[in-house]
């Protein structure tokens, strides 16, 4: 999947952009908005009715080197009196982001984008019953 | 990749950290090939607590498309599809990284960027603090 | 426990006002954020107005936006919803809440959500 060239209509090429190699870019992983403020509401892992558990996940070759994933912790959803209804169902909500990953080939190394798919939490939902004809 | 040529003692300065600026290759490696969007794709309907799904564009940013999740209802679905008040639709958020043009609309120079998304929305019990 | 109390509503006429109180008990407002809510007869519970003491940020709702004011006496632990230029429209039951999130980003149906305590309400009706 390669990322798009700006589209001529739009964007015009200033004089300023550095020169690149062929079929390669320039990536600054100085990251913009590093400590950002996040509101999210507290302990809501635990709080759902399709609750989760969080594991880190560590590759030193891989920019982020963490990366936090949610495990939904029942195959069904906790009802008002904390037991699990199996005729519910807790299912991942998942989301893409990018990382830098470092390849070693030899006594070289290379820079690769990489698409990495994030399970973020839980969210429980009514199944969905596919009738046969 | 783009191979860039290591120290002349390569074996022992095994760097730790990643260099401030890399060259890397215009092909973005998708590690996402096992998952099954027909199924997760209405979730955001069926779930208790459901969400809406904004467009977000930037043709200045990689993705320039994000959609962004919004709770429809303060309080969750109950079995009998009325919203239940006693209970709260919560959205669950995620940091990103995106790609930024830097210097702007340059096509092939970037720098990363965190950004802060609402991917879905969940159904939780209310916490109360009691005060001492 | 945590507890609120809404008084003030009634019946007024359209283009009039009344103030709404607010009186939290079990807690103060340094523990939670508030959120001014309402429910019409057949509709859902919509969110008017937020507030956090932390900072003093407020937050309406575009329907209210300009007539609604929100302010708070931390003595008297009471958050009070001025509300001014009232139309029919603006007749529901009001209610005021203890929440823990208040995100001007507003991914939720509301920015502050996440409610912890609901009071039980107070009526208002305007006429035309």
């Known amino acids: 999947r390669k990322i798009p060239k700006v589209g001529h209509t739009f964007f015009q090429k200033p004089e300023s952009c550095p020169p690149v190699p062929g079929g390669s870019m320039k990536l600054d992983i100085g990251i913009i908005n590093e400590n950002q403020r996040v509101s999210m509401s507290r302990n809501i892992e635990s709080r759902s009715t399709s609750p989760w558990n969080y594991t880190v996940t560590w590759d030193p070759n891989r920019y982020p080197s963490e990366v936090v994933q949610a495990q939904c912790r029942n195959l069904g959803c906790i009802n008002a009196q904390g037991k699990e209804d199996i005729s519910m169902n807790s299912v991942p909500i998942q989301q893409e982001t990018l990382v830098v990953r470092r390849k070693h080939q030899g006594c070289s190394v290379s820079f690769q984008l990489e698409k990495v798919l994030v399970t973020v939490g839980c969210t429980c939902v009514t199944p969905v019953i596919h009738h046969v004809q | 990749g783009i191979t860039i040529p290591r120290n002349p003692g390569c074996p022992n300065s095994e760097d730790k950290n990643f260099p401030r600026t890399v060259m890397v290759n215009l092909n973005i490696h998708n590690r996402n090939t096992n998952t099954n969007p027909k199924r997760s794709s209405d979730y955001y309907n069926r779930s208790t607590s459901p969400w809406n799904l904004h467009r977000n564009e930037d043709p200045e940013r990689y993705p320039s498309v994000i959609w962004e999740a919004k709770c429809r209802h303060l309080g969750c679905i109950n079995a009998d599809g009325n919203v239940d008040y006693h209970m709260n639709s919560v959205p669950i958020q995620q940091e990103i990284l995106v790609l930024r043009r830097e210097p702007p609309h340059c096509p092939n120079s970037f720098r990363l960027e965190k950004i802060l998304v609402s991917v879905g929305c969940t159904c939780v019990t209310p916490i109360v603090h009691h005060v001492a | 426990e945590v507890q609120l109390v809404e008084s003030g509503g009634g019946l007024v006429q359209a283009g009039g006002s009344l103030r709404l109180s607010c009186a939290a008990s079990?807690?103060?407002?340094?523990?939670?954020?508030i959120g001014w809510f309402r429910q019409a007869p057949g509709k859902e519970r919509e969110g008017v107005s937020c507030?956090?003491?932390?900072?003093?940020?407020?937050f309406y709702a575009d329907s209210v936006k300009g007539r609604f004011t929100v302010s708070a006496d931390n003595a008297k632990n009471t958050v009070y919803l001025q509300m001014n230029s009232l139309e029919p429209e603006d007749t529901a039951v009001y209610f005021c809440?203890?929440?823990?999130?208040?995100?001007?980003?507003?991914?939720?149906?509301?920015?502050?959500?996440?409610?912890?305590?609901w009071g039980q309400g107070t009526q208002v009706t305007v006429s035309s």
């Open positions: 809440a203890a929440v823990n999130t208040f995100d001007e980003s507003a991914y939720a149906a509301f920015a502050c959500y996440d409610v912890v305590r």
């Open positions: 507030f956090t003491s932390s900072d003093g940020r407020t």
């Open positions: 079990g807690f103060t407002f340094d523990d939670y954020d």
